[in-house]
């Protein structure tokens, strides 16, 4: 878990224990098993704007 | 350039342990993970475990819980591996490897292998 | 945990012709992000392993293009189109999909 009173990831990063720093989502396609690629999987979709009001 | 160097040739008893060491030069140790494999003469390749040096977090092949300990020493950049209760079975080449965590893959980078004989 | 299935030996290859080492995972090795995560390594006699191909058919850099590899999720190939004699040793393939890190046997390539 993150530490607590350290700034939250970044959109398109997650937190890693491991390496104690949040770390590029992008890095999952590397090794796809590494402790925060669960929580890139986890992230909801970057929000996208309605067509209609 | 990324080197790994491991220690020299151990001979050692049955039931005694032993702890080999990889110094990491060329990168930022921290950053990558080290990952310890285990070759028997003419033999394949039998992932150990692997550390986080970083934060020394590890993750075993349930195989070698209780058999190897690995530790990192970030102020030295060197990754050990102690084995324990020592066997003939034990007797191998080890190897460490430098295996990356990020989208730029980079390939992995290998020790030249500590040859650990157990014998009486 | 991913076992990794080679034959110990690949068909004696003459210099100059081509030769294919395959290898089989008990699970798929592609992922739902599309790479399959398949390596190959050669260890030349006397040395370390080194990486040859990565996720399934990316050369690894220094290595000639005289190698390159395919296959589905399970069932894989790696192919030398010209055998040079520094080509000689064991072919490893390996996975990267998740932990237990596992390798296949081994395939030593001979020549004729």
């Known amino acids: 878990e993150q530490a607590p009173g350290t700034a939250p990831c970044s959109r398109g990063s997650s937190w890693s224990a491991d390496l104690d720093k949040c770390m590029d989502c992008a890095s999952c396609r590397a090794r796809p098993h590494s402790d925060f690629c669960l929580g890139c999987a986890a992230a909801p979709p970057a929000p996208f704007r309605l067509l209609w009001p | 350039q990324v080197q790994l160097q491991q220690s020299g040739p151990e001979l050692v008893k049955p039931g005694a342990s032993v702890k080999m060491s990889c110094k990491a030069s060329g990168y930022t140790f921290t950053d990558f993970i080290i990952a310890w494999v285990k070759q028997r003469t003419g033999q394949g390749l039998e992932w150990i475990g692997e550390i986080y040096p970083g934060t020394g977090r590890t993750y075993y092949s349930e195989k070698f819980r209780g058999k190897a300990t690995l530790t990192a020493d970030k102020s030295s950049n060197t990754a050990y591996m102690q084995l324990s209760s020592l066997t003939s079975v034990d007797s191998a080449v080890y190897f460490c490897?430098?295996?990356?965590?990020?989208?730029?893959?980079?390939?992995?980078?290998w020790g030249q292998g500590t040859t650990l004989t157990v014998s009486s | 945990d991913i076992v990794m299935t080679q034959a110990a030996f690949s068909n004696p290859v003459t210099l100059g012709t081509s030769a294919s080492i395959s290898c089989r995972s008990s699970k798929s090795l592609l992922h739902s992000n599309g790479i399959t995560y398949l390596y190959w390594y050669l260890q030349k006699p006397g040395q370390s392993p080194q990486l040859l191909i990565y996720?399934?058919?990316n050369l690894a850099s220094g290595v000639p293009d005289r190698f390159s590899s395919s296959g589905s999720g399970t069932d894989f190939t790696l192919r030398i189109s010209r055998v040079e004699a520094e080509d000689v040793g064991v072919y490893y393939c390996?996975?990267?999909?998740?932990?237990?890190?596992?390798f296949g046997g081994g395939t030593k390539l001979e020549l004729k």
């Open positions: 996720q399934m058919s």
């Open positions: 390996a996975h990267n999909l998740e932990l237990p890190w596992t």
């Open positions: 490897a430098r295996r990356t965590i990020y989208y730029d893959y980079d390939g992995d980078y």
